[in-house]
Interface confidence: low
Amino acid sequence: DAHKSEVAHRFKDLGEENFKALVLIAFAQYLQQCPFEDHVKLVNEVTEFAKTCVADESAENCDKSLHTLFGDKLCTVATLRETYGEMADCCAKQEPERNECFLQHKDDNPNLPRLVRPEVDVMCTAFHDNEETFLKKYLYEIARRHPYFYAPELLFFAKRYKAAFTECCQAADKAACLLPKLDELRDEGKASSAKQRLKCASLQKFGERAFKAWAVARLSQRFPKAEFAEVSKLVTDLTKVHTECCHGDLLECADDRADLAKYICENQDSISSKLKECCEKPLLEKSHCIAEVENDEMPADLPSLAADFVESKDVCKNYAEAKDVFLGMFLYEYARRHPDYSVVLLLRLAKTYETTLEKCCAAADPHECYAKVFDEFKPLVEEPQNLIKQNCELFEQLGEYKFQNALLVRYTKKVPQVSTPTLVEVSRNLGKVGSKCCKHPEAKRMPCAEDYLSVVLNQLCVLHEKTPVSDRVTKCCTESLVNRRPCFSALEVDETYVPKEFNAETFTFHADICTLSEKERQIKKQTALVELVKHKPKATKEQLKAVMDDFAAFVEKCCKADDKETCFAEEGKKLVAASQAALGL
């Protein structure tokens, strides 16, 4: 239904608080380098304008689209050219090209300082002194570092952030109360950002059809009692929500997500028996809860899939009449029966089924041609099963840190051209699959592991896209969304790589390593490990292990020394020389 003033419509639907928060997120995700105060000023101006439109929808400019209003506002920033360079050229374009231009300049790895958390007393004083500004800063800092963060979900995080400070700043031991909560929010936030980034990449790089296929598979696993028509409706609505958020239309996205949650809760009897608790919560918690809800139980006595999709004489007729609907039904029926499969595996099976029908429905005897299609699924199912089994065994044998190191070596040898920080970040995250998924029983391992790996490999793909350095990475990232993980798994050592020249500076360490947290110290060591492999890609596991053990001993020794800096300087030289000899550098 058309509204005279879109901005007034969204302001009324969302309320002033959510409106302001979402506009701040939108602006920070577009202009990631702009100072906080500048964004607050822009948001206040937009809010005041929206209020005039609420009072009179026919007032001047109130009929303009949100993209026009927001784009015009962003283009008033005085330092646009000097801060953002060619992004300023976007302002010469008309909508919708201007918004597309802004979207293309979103930076997944902005050059911003690492956020450092102050002491608890300092934060509590800041929180009490000006709660509103404190929470706005949180939205701003997260949004500018994560330009695709799912905006309505960021409102949920901000609500939890506020609750943590409200509770803990009154506690007897503020730090014991607050720090674990902040750590949890940080880790969940990173995971949420990465999951949403994959959704946006799926929509933007592979199109709406790819996203809808993913959604059909996932929702069918989650709501196996729902009819196909119901799942299709949810998929259509969910696709609209994520298309909007990924496109920077955050007000529409948040509004439509609230409508979807309302619909699901009003129709939970025909969707899932697991929604009751979610639907009793307030809006932000409700939407989050629905998104994370466990899979409902599978209906009893589901008939064999073969009857409708292999044995029926009408397979090609049904396929020809409405290809995507028929394939959607196949995906729905297969997914609701297989909560034990990853979504990407289900999509590979659907693709194989589609390819077979395309070929066979044009053959002389179609039925004879596609009769054995389900046999083609067996190797596709066994490949991830075997891989997960092997890697979980390795994880249980090594523990998380050493398992990450094994992956660091494996991936550096596969794609040594990729920057060291990216290899460390991605391999560390790949390694977390062990503690995240290997504890699960067999039936839950594959959906946990392979779908998580899809999220992590997408991080590699978006970081690599910014500065492409490896044709192999580009190939695996762009050829097929569902085959990214098998593509990377299949990569062998890159024989074309010319080893990096040895640079002693890379392996020079200082006493500051002693004061680092365990996590930061691990990252330092893992950075050195990647550099070693880049220098000596043919080094054996045993050689690398020996050098890393020596390195760990060196750090431990010097951190206990009275004169730490001298120890690092002198012992460091010896270590470098010994490592060079051990690796034949």
Epitope: R114, L115, V116, P118, E119, M123
Partner: nanobody, 124 residues
């Protein structure tokens, strides 16, 4: 109103050292987080280092870790930045800043009071 005055800048050869000082007046110094930022010609202002009220926590940008050391003397209302192993890319105007309430040490907008800056030039 807090006033901040930096000193100690100068010209130094690569590998050399300097000690910057920042004297504060007009407020209760021990209640402020103190930070150092720098701005090279034609570049954005960037975070260098920060120190909490009672020196419990110190923070450094990756580019200066292991070379620069921040410290403070609350009895003298002064914060120091020791610059060792200086490089040409450290050439910049170094600003001292004070923050009463902060949620992120590294963000320049968190700091309420700023000095005029002291120039450090590293050149052979």
């Amino acid at each position: 109103e807090v006033q901040l005055v930096e000193s100690g800048g100068g010209v130094v050869q690569p590998g050399g050292s300097l000690r910057l000082s920042c004297a504060a007046s007009g407020g209760t110094f021990s209640t402020y987080v103190m930070g150092w930022f720098r701005q090279a010609p034609g570049k954005e202002r960037e975070f260098v280092s920060a120190i909490s009220q009672n020196s419990i926590h110190t923070y450094y940008a990756d580019s200066v870790k292991g070379r620069f050391t921040i410290s403070r003397d609350n009895s003298k209302n002064t914060v120091y930045l020791q610059l060792n192993s200086l490089r040409p890319e450290d050439t910049a105007l170094y600003y001292c800043a004070a923050s009463r309430f902060t949620s992120w040490y590294t963000a320049d907008y968190e700091y309420d009071y700023w000095g005029q800056g002291t120039l450090v030039t590293v050149s052979s």
